[in-house]
Amino acid sequence: MAPWPELGDAQPNPDKYLEGAAGQQPTAPDKSKETNKTDNTEAPVTKIELLPSYSTATLIDEPTEVDDPWNLPTLQDSGIKWSERDTKGKILCFFQGIGRLILLLGFLYFFVCSLDILSSAFQLVGGKMAGQFFSNSSIMSNPLLGLVIGVLVTVLVQSSSTSTSIVVSMVSSSLLTVRAAIPIIMGANIGTSITNTIVALMQVGDRSEFRRAFAGATVHDFFNWLSVLVLLPVEVATHYLEIITQLIVESFHFKNGEDAPDLLKVITKPFTKLIVQLDKKVISQIAMNDEKAKNKSLVKIWCKTFTNKTQINVTVPSTANCTSPSLCWTDGIQNWTMKNVTYKENIAKCQHIFVNFHLPDLAVGTILLILSLLVLCGCLIMIVKILGSVLKGQVATVIKKTINTDFPFPFAWLTGYLAILVGAGMTFIVQSSSVFTSALTPLIGIGVITIERAYPLTLGSNIGTTTTAILAALASPGNALRSSLQIALCHFFFNISGILLWYPIPFTRLPIRMAKGLGNISAKYRWFAVFYLIIFFFLIPLTVFGLSLAGWRVLVGVGVPVVFIIILVLCLRLLQSRCPRVLPKKLQNWNFLPLWMRSLKPWDAVVSKFTGCFQMRCCCCCRVCCRACCLLCDCPKCCRCSKCCEDLEEAQEGQDVPVKAPETFDNITISREAQGEVPASDSKTECTAL
């Protein structure tokens, strides 16, 4: 489970916390009495903010209110203004801008083309029985499995736009129903948030920067996880997304078949027909369950055909029966001739890559699937790089002016909603939420943007990314436009629903508090950031995937007890913090659990020992290795042989954060551990408290 911060009233400084502390008590204790408590003593303690009881046991106090890690540091703007450029600089800048615009349009074109090819690839990969497989198989009828497929695919392709486009292509190819696609879209929303979390790891060198950056990145994760946690069961029960989007799409009155608008296909067809062409007649025959079509290849071979009013007739007993002497032959077994029925004589082959390969449909489809995915990802990356280079320098100034400034009272509350619009707009421009949020992450880390302001920007980004899905829908052929547009709208309304759940009322902004809690833990135990990433984006989805494939019985058998334990822990946690007196004394805190179950300190010792031998070798390599080492072992002093780690060590020495005085502790076990009375981890692996 993700670390769960205190769910009570938000305090001005929620990072002043005790990790692994007991439940909060309403009355303040006598400090002198508290220091004399034994391990098993249960007594009222000071009301303070808490992180989950199973998080780290080490206690830190931020130096002063001025040095609050969640406060923004002073920033210096960089970037040459237009007015400050000389004539040569202005001309160069202008032509660079034109060049970037051309490149941008080019990559956008190939992006749309790759969507078209992706649709063809799914038709080929799906093969003759694809429709039945996707509509009947457990993979598509199990929403939980759909969800984790969405997460894993998006984690692998590093873009929700790409995985959403895949789903849209599958829907437009009729390989997937809208209902089955919705959980995949939800999973894609979760998966895309890994990108900016990875970006946040790059700021591991500076503890306070890392705290802010990691929290800023994981606010996206928590929003998506919480949204799915609530909305997936709601969707499974009510199908509200499917119903709403169906009503909207039907109100557009799209025509089916040939008369439907091809829109982007008009400009993409000249390119896509050079890659692959499908025999539309075979596709329609398969759709109508034509048995003869099952042995036919979907890849179009002959484009130029001569239509003659004759047809091959295998029933000619001998060549003497030929209707036309010149159009008569044998294949050694049967005699053929042309009858007075339309017959297409193949004259010229199609001019596409796969025309002469004679590969099975599955092979062609797989090749195209991989290539179109690569092009999709590549185009998205290049679009972002181009836009990134355009925005570089001026982005900090623009963001600080537009985002961190509140409207005057009484309209201050509207600022967040403007931030949502800005986030949506920016993502609409860059065509990728992961890119926009990844750009935000270092800005949060260095203090350009507060987490409170980054949160609505991220939510807006989730809305903005749906425009890519709408683009994908518009690239679908006319008769598939409705279904693909519907799935794009499902993505849109899912994000809207999530915003309505976790934004309008300040109390419901759980993702901020959860992200800050995780930021604090990861700043203290930096290896936990990697652990979190692996658990939430790989292990949990893969476990659910495995259990789902094993069947509903296995999934329920394992899932129900796990969910029950989680709910039990949460309820107990809530009671401990709200009304501990209703609980038996033993359950008023977590001391009844062994230390490894309620603190990260023992785990830290294990990780430190495990990475001990790796640290010295790794740190001597380069700055990147050093940062990776420091992330894992949380110990810059272990890297003395590396100049970069010495620099880090020196920088940290001037910023050491004092450990809280034992009299403020609400738990003697933790108090003693901090003072060294209780055996903790090996001191050799603990170089510094922070």
Partner: antibody, heavy 120, light 107 residues
Framework: QVQLVQSGAEVKKPGSSVKVSCKAS????????IHWVRQAPGQGLEWMGG????????NYKQNFRGRVTITADESTSTAYMELSSLRSEDTAVYYC?????????????WGQGTTVTVSS | DIQVTQSPSSLSTSVGDRVTITCTAS??????VAWYQQKPGKSPKLLIY???TRHTGVPERFTGSGSGTDFTLTISSVQPEDVATYFC?????????FGVGTKVEIK
């Protein structure tokens, strides 16, 4: 790519029989006719017969009827040619070749050939 | 059975020369004629089908023509790699029959 891989060379005694296999890959086996053609040393090509794998319809050249049997196994995409009552004049290289069913494109791909030597 | 006669049985030419091989069927075969190339020690390869349609990947220097009973294969500019035996085949009626072959050599 399109491949027709034939079995190895055989040395047989007169009166015995030989079975040559031809494994197809890189195309839809059932969409093609598999023909067998032989070439005696220093001679031209002689068509022996063929089979349509998806319905097992066969046809043989008159002078081979009763002596040759052509079969096909769809599951393994393999065609077989069995020639019985071997004589010394049956010493030749035996080729399998494919022909697109319902097309007049002739034998567009051939196997590498199997040398059958008949000697006492 | 339709008899297919090929001429000449062999010919010697120089690189760059134009070569014409003829094939005569004992009866009208329409355009149901194919041409094959067999290099020494190799299996035959299809060059031309339906009398004049060049098979995929066949160089443009190879052209086929004719209908009825008389057919020709022309190599417009002979290359060293064209050293082979060329066979014509009729597929108007069963059994399929081949010509005896024309061996092309380079001087």
């Amino acid at each position: 790519q399109v491949q027709l891989v034939q079995s190895g060379a055989e040395v047989k005694k007169p009166g015995s029989s030989v079975k040559v296999s031809c494994k197809a890959s890189g195309f839809f086996f059932t969409e093609y006719i598999i023909h067998w053609v032989r070439q005696a040393p220093g001679q031209g090509l002689e068509w022996m017969g063929g089979i349509i794998p998806n319905n097992d319809v066969t046809n043989y050249k008159q002078n081979f009827r009763g002596r040759v049997t052509i079969t096909a196994d769809e599951s393994t995409s393999t065609a077989y040619m069995e020639l019985s009552s071997l004589r010394s004049e049956d010493t030749a290289v035996y080729y399998c070749a494919r022909w697109r069913n319902a097309y007049y494109s002739a034998m567009d791909s051939w196997g590498q050939g199997t040398t059958v030597t008949v000697s006492s | 059975d339709i008899q297919v006669t090929q001429s000449p049985s062999s010919l010697s030419t120089s690189v760059g020369d134009r070569v014409t091989i003829t094939c005569t069927a004992s009866q009208d075969v329409g355009t149901a004629v194919a041409w094959y190339q067999q290099k020494p020690g190799k299996s035959p390869k299809l060059l031309i089908y339906w009398a004049s349609t060049r098979h995929t990947g066949v160089p443009e220097r190879f052209t086929g023509s004719g209908s009825g009973t008389d057919f020709t294969l022309t190599i417009s500019s002979v290359q060293p790699e064209d050293v082979a035996t060329y066979f014509c085949q009729q597929y108007r009626t069963s059994p399929l029959t081949f010509g005896v072959g024309t061996k092309v050599e380079i001087k």
